[in-house]
């Protein structure tokens, strides 16, 4: 039975040009994370296994750094950038485990003043 | 220019072990993963297991575990694929590949190996 | 394990024509798909990298497409050199598996 919850940075926003780090924590389960996948819509930006180490795709890998932890750092952030983020945690022997992020990422100017989080 | 020069042909009984090297040159050794991979006759491509040199750690596939060792040697580039307790399903062209986010860039030429009695 | 089932197993095409060779694999596995060329007495040769991406050097009537379980290699223009069998495989997850192959003869 699949007892593990994954807690999420939820949504958050950035800065276009500026960098953001996605997290993702796994709790309530002792299964043992074999490999976390960080994907994209319908990419996958990142590896990290327990045994191997970090392996970033090579389409990202100018733009993608490894961590914190199991999490990812996204730099140069582009409004393309906005969109649903996946972490997907493989555990043995529980199984699979995702967590979504919602990235966006505001003008320089729009970050700035926060205008776009008053309240009226 | 990136190679991999993998040691010759070898004939083994059942039961004996087989140790295969794969040589790498042309490129940082411990920047890429050396990974292992087999073809026996008019089967498909089988991953068997896989080192990163630079930390040792390993992954196998789990019909191999206990009966392959795959190990790697920073000081001369070369990994090394030990398979055990051989029988004549392990008969075979045994690939060593460099890994690149988990494909495989280039090939080193194939080790046959036969296991007969 | 993630199973990767390749159709056809064997495809017959006139030269200069189109070839197509499909890869579904029995789970998600977002881009994560590699696609090779093998000939007999040679190595494999890398191809098609993240579904989509061509390798160094391929030449560009090789294509792939496709993401999740459903993947695509496209041979636009068939050349005598391209007879060979060609696999996919997921670097999705581990263990790392291959398709069956595809046999690509010319008609």
């Known amino acids: 039975m699949m007892t593990g919850t994954i807690e999420t940075t939820g949504n958050i926003s950035a800065e276009k040009g500026g960098s953001i780090i996605l997290q993702c924590h796994l709790s309530s389960t002792t299964a043992q994370v074999t490999q976390v996948n960080w994907e994209q819509q319908d990419q996958l930006l990142a590896i990290c296994n327990a045994d191997l180490g970090w392996h970033i795709s090579p389409s990202f890998k100018d733009r993608v750094a490894p961590g914190p932890g199991l999490g990812l750092t996204l730099q140069s952030l582009t409004v393309n950038d906005t969109g649903e983020y996946f972490c997907i945690y493989h555990t043995y022997p529980d199984g699979t485990y995702t967590g979504r992020i919602f990235l966006e990422v505001l003008e320089s100017s729009v970050a700035e003043h926060g205008a776009r989080f008053q309240i009226p | 220019e990136v190679q991999l020069v993998q040691s010759g042909a070898e004939v083994k009984k059942p039961g004996a072990s087989v140790k295969v090297s794969c040589k790498a040159s042309?490129?940082?050794?411990?920047?890429?993963?050396i990974e292992w991979v087999r073809q026996a006759p008019g089967q498909r491509l089988e991953w068997m297991g896989v080192?990163?040199?630079?930390?040792?750690?390993?992954n196998y596939k789990e019909k191999f575990k206990g009966r392959v060792t795959i190990t790697a040697d920073k000081s001369s580039s070369t990994a090394y694929m030990e398979l055990s307790s051989l029988r004549s399903e392990d008969t075979a062209v045994y690939y060593c590949?460099?890994?690149?986010?988990?494909?495989?860039?280039?090939w080193g030429q194939g080790t046959t190996v036969t296991v007969s009695s | 394990d993630i199973v990767m089932t390749q159709s056809p197993d064997s495809l017959a095409v006139s030269l200069g024509e189109r070839a197509t060779i499909n890869c579904k694999a029995s789970?998600?596995?977002?881009?994560?798909v590699a696609w090779y060329q093998h000939k007999p007495g040679q190595s494999p040769k890398l191809l098609i990298y993240?579904?989509?991406y061509r390798y160094t050097g391929v030449p560009d009537r090789f294509s792939g497409s496709g993401s999740g379980t459903d993947f695509t290699l496209t041979i636009s223009s068939l050349q005598a050199e391209d007879v060979a069998v060609y696999y996919c495989?997921?670097?999705?997850?581990?263990?790392?598996?291959f398709g069956g192959g595809t046999k690509v003869e010319i008609k």
């Open positions: 789970q998600h596995v977002s881009d994560g």
């Open positions: 590949a460099r890994g690149e986010y988990f494909f495989f860039d280039y």
């Open positions: 080192i990163n040199p630079g930390s040792g750690g390993t």
């Open positions: 993240s579904a989509s």
């Open positions: 042309g490129y940082a050794f411990t920047n890429y993963l």
């Open positions: 495989q997921q670097h999705y997850n581990t263990p790392h598996t």
